[in-house]
């Protein structure tokens, strides 16, 4: 079954990204996203999740890693890593299905 998003009790999360309106946010869960764009160093963003919880289940790749948790400020001290670079024929896709 698809993961049903819920707008039940909200949790307070650390917010650290260019789009944060303050040091914390409120959401259904907390997130950490580590992204490496072509030719750039990986960037780690912390924030809140309300939609598409399936992203939390996606396996890490050499370009992105998603982490989710469900308690107060649980994303504050989390550090993520990316998968080691693999030969092109073995690269995992970002589609988590």
């Amino acid at each position: 079954d698809p993961v049903k998003p819920s707008r039940g009790p909200l949790v307070t999360c650390t917010c650290e990204s260019p789009h944060c309106k303050g040091p914390t946010c409120r959401g259904a869960w907390c997130t950490v996203v580590l992204v490496r764009e072509e030719g750039r160093h990986p960037q780690e963003h912390r924030g809140c999740g309300n939609l598409h919880r399936e992203l939390c289940r996606g396996r890490p790749t050499e370009f992105v890693n998603h982490y989710c948790c469900d308690s107060h400020l649980c994303n504050h001290n989390v550090s993520l890593v990316l998968e080691a670079t693999q030969p092109p024929s073995e690269q995992p896709g970002t589609d988590g299905q």
Epitope: P2, K4, P5, H19, N50, L55, F63, H66, T94, G96
Partner: antibody
Framework: QVQLQESGPGLVKPSQTLSLTCTVS??????????WNWIRQHPGKGLEWIGY???????YYNPSLKSRVTISVDTSKNQFSLKLSSVTAADTAVYYC??????????WGQGTLVTVSS | EIVLTQSPGTLSLSPGERATLSCRAS???????LAWYQQKPGQAPRLLIY???SRATGIPDRFSGSGSGTDFTLTISRLEPEDFAVYYC?????????FGQGTRLEIK
């Protein structure tokens, strides 16, 4: 005001790859609050979700199209793109891009008709 | 996969009347992520209602949404000439995103 604009060829030959780009203006594609979707509508029919991409590059696709679909994002250009391979006449449709937030698909492109014909 | 079934397929009413459109889900869905859209010929869909009952920006208050679980309703309290269009319900926020097949609201 957020605006989305689809662009790409209006005519594609059978067995080739359909390629469309959605350019977002008035807002950042890199905001973690939003998910960037492609939807299509066959002539005279209903709406069919194709897939979405998050700013991180993570994608999810409609299982019925997954084997032929690739969605990618270019945050530096504030664009995301759709590629649909091995097209047939059954892929003739109006293709829309749309922004998804907790408030639904709140912004849509105007749509672009893609005809598959030799 | 959640299947959304809309009824009736076509609804024929006159301006000033009340329209009631139904959307039934094949399994329970979160009411926070049920939306309704209006589409007119040659135009993109327009968001009317999100989260089952919240009106989108600029949508007149004659449009209202209700429901929970598997049964959802869009009500237009007093039809205006510009309301005659096709209406779609949608489940969003988790995969796969699905749309109903649509209800055509036509002038009687």
């Amino acid at each position: 005001q957020v605006q989305l604009q689809e662009s790409g060829p209006g005519l594609v030959k059978p067995s080739q790859t359909l390629s469309l780009t959605c350019t977002v203006s008035g807002g950042s594609i890199s905001s973690g609050e939003y998910y960037w979707n492609w939807i299509r509508q066959h002539p005279g029919k209903g709406l069919e979700w194709i897939g979405y991409i998050y700013y991180s590059g993570s994608t999810y696709y409609n299982p019925s199209l997954k084997s032929r679909v690739t969605i990618s994002v270019d945050t530096s250009k504030n664009q995301f793109s759709l590629k649909l391979s091995s097209v047939t006449a059954a892929d003739t449709a109006v293709y829309y891009c749309a922004r998804e937030s907790v408030a639904g698909f709140d912004y849509w492109g105007q749509g672009t008709l893609v005809t598959v014909s030799s | 996969e959640i299947v959304l079934t809309q009824s009736p397929g076509t609804l024929s009413l006159s301006p000033g009347e009340r329209a009631t459109l139904s959307c039934r889900a094949s399994q329970s869905v979160s009411s926070s992520y049920l939306a309704w859209y209006q589409q007119k010929p040659g135009q993109a869909p327009r968001l009317l209602i999100y989260g089952t009952s919240s009106r989108a920006t600029g949508i007149p208050d004659r449009f209202s949404g209700s429901g929970s679980g598997t049964d959802f309703t869009l009500t237009i309290s007093r039809l205006e000439p510009e309301d005659f269009a096709v209406y779609y319900c949608q489940v969003y926020g988790s995969i796969p995103i699905t749309f109903g097949q649509g209800t055509r609201l036509e002038i009687k």
